[in-house]
């Protein structure tokens, strides 16, 4: 005997109390697949969460974090406090990056500046709490007699006067 519930589409549930009639999901609930015997309660975006997408009868709500927080985990299951650039979040709150480290985002941890010398390069721009160092040419490239960092201007062809 065919299970009549299999005919119930997404957005409905198979109501055994009413001879397996497909009843619409009640407000604040959904069923994303057919043949369901119950509808799932919609996620509520409350507190530090705000609604990005409301629940429909066939899909759950989706949440974002309110201003000053960012999402963590699958489907934004948690909200974590933002810090400023140049800081990282610790158990005691937002703390400035230690010397030699930086964070260019509002989330995540402070990371060490790039060690230019490991690549045989020199520091072109010093690092800050918010920005990594910028590595430039190696010291040898900048020594007297070495070729310039910028290519020479091309020589004019004979017989052409300057513009």
């Amino acid at each position: 005997l065919q299970d009549l519930c299999s005919n119930c589409p997404a957005g409905t549930f198979c109501d055994n109390n009413r001879s397996q009639i497909c009843s619409p999901c009640p407000p604040n609930s959904f069923s994303s697949a057919g043949g369901q015997r119950t509808c799932d309660i919609c996620r509520q975006c409350k507190g530090v969460f705000k609604t990005r997408k409301e629940c429909s009868s066939t899909s759950n709500a989706e949440c974002d974090c309110i201003s000053g927080y960012h999402c963590l985990g699958a489907e934004c299951s948690m909200c974590e406090q933002d810090c400023k650039q140049g800081q990282e979040l610790t158990k005691k709150g937002c703390k400035d990056c230690c010397f030699g480290t930086f964070n260019d985002q509002k989330r995540g941890i402070c990371r060490p500046w790039t060690n230019c010398s490991l690549d045989g390069k020199s520091v072109l721009v010093n690092g800050t709490k918010e920005r990594d160092v910028v590595c430039g040419p190696s010291p040898a490239d900048l020594s007297p007699g070495a070729s310039s960092a910028t290519p020479p201007a091309p020589a004019r062809e004979p017989g052409h006067s300057p513009q």
């Epitope: 407000p27 604040n28 919609c42 990005r52 997408k53 409301e54 629940c55 429909s56 066939t58």
Partner: antibody, heavy 116, light 107 residues
């Protein structure tokens, strides 16, 4: 900021039909329900139904099932309510309002007058 | 359909007074009640959601309480801009329904 724009007024003859519009802006149209609410002069609010623009899910108040049809145009972020076989009892202010459960943003309302 | 009964139909108070509005549901609706006010010739505005949750941008003098069948909206010190019609709405089951409203007028 979130806005729901509705025409101020519509005048139609008895027996005719009308299509009321509600243009949404300031948010992702397909992510939030649009509800329609009727208010006759000096009377309480009456929920007509709602539509989810993301997938065209609809729910209707049984009193309006043969009167109102809800649709959306996703390309213009506009919700519509088609009212048929109009009589003087359909003369009212019709509001569109955003929200799945509590209605957090409302249009200014369209005053529908049914008169010959 | 769930019937929402609001009482009284009219409340007369002076500015600065505390006022409470009542909304009674015909069956248990948990906390699926929302409160609105509507000034003359204006659109309704959401004041409280889910019986007691505050709404961003709504003054803190508005508060809500209750669950099951009996709900209350309170204004702890009425201001001149609060004189309006007040409606409750349930979202526990289809169709959504509104109460008949309470008019808050100046005494």
């Amino acid at each position: 900021q979130v806005q729901l724009q509705q025409p101020g007024a519509e005048l139609v003859k008895p027996g005719a039909s009308v299509k009321l519009s509600c243009k949404a802006s300031g948010y992702t149209f397909t992510n939030f329900w649009i509800n329609w609410v009727k208010q006759r002069p000096g009377q309480a609010l009456e929920w007509i139904g709602n539509i989810y623009p993301g997938n065209d899910n609809t729910n209707y108040n049984g009193n309006f099932k043969s009167k109102a049809t809800l649709t959306v145009d996703r390309s213009s972020s506009t919700a519509y309510m088609h009212l048929s076989s109009l009589t003087s009892k359909d003369s009212a202010v019709y509001y569109c309002a955003r929200g799945q459960l509590g209605l957090d943003y409302w249009g200014q309302g369209t005053t529908l007058t049914v008169s010959s | 359909d769930i019937l929402l009964t609001q009482s009284p139909a009219i409340l007369s108070v002076s500015p600065g007074e505390r006022v409470s509005f009542s909304c009674r549901a015909s069956q248990n609706i948990g906390t699926a009640i929302h409160w609105y006010h509507q000034r003359t010739n204006g659109s309704p505005r959401l004041l409280i959601k889910f019986a007691s949750e505050s709404i961003s941008g709504i003054p803190s003098r508005f508060s809500g309480s209750g669950s099951g069948t009996d709900f209350t909206l309170s204004i702890n010190s009425v201001e001149s801009e609060d004189f309006a019609d007040y409606y409750c709405q349930q979202s526990n089951s289809w169709p959504f329904t509104f109460g008949s409203g309470t008019k808050l007028e100046i005494k």
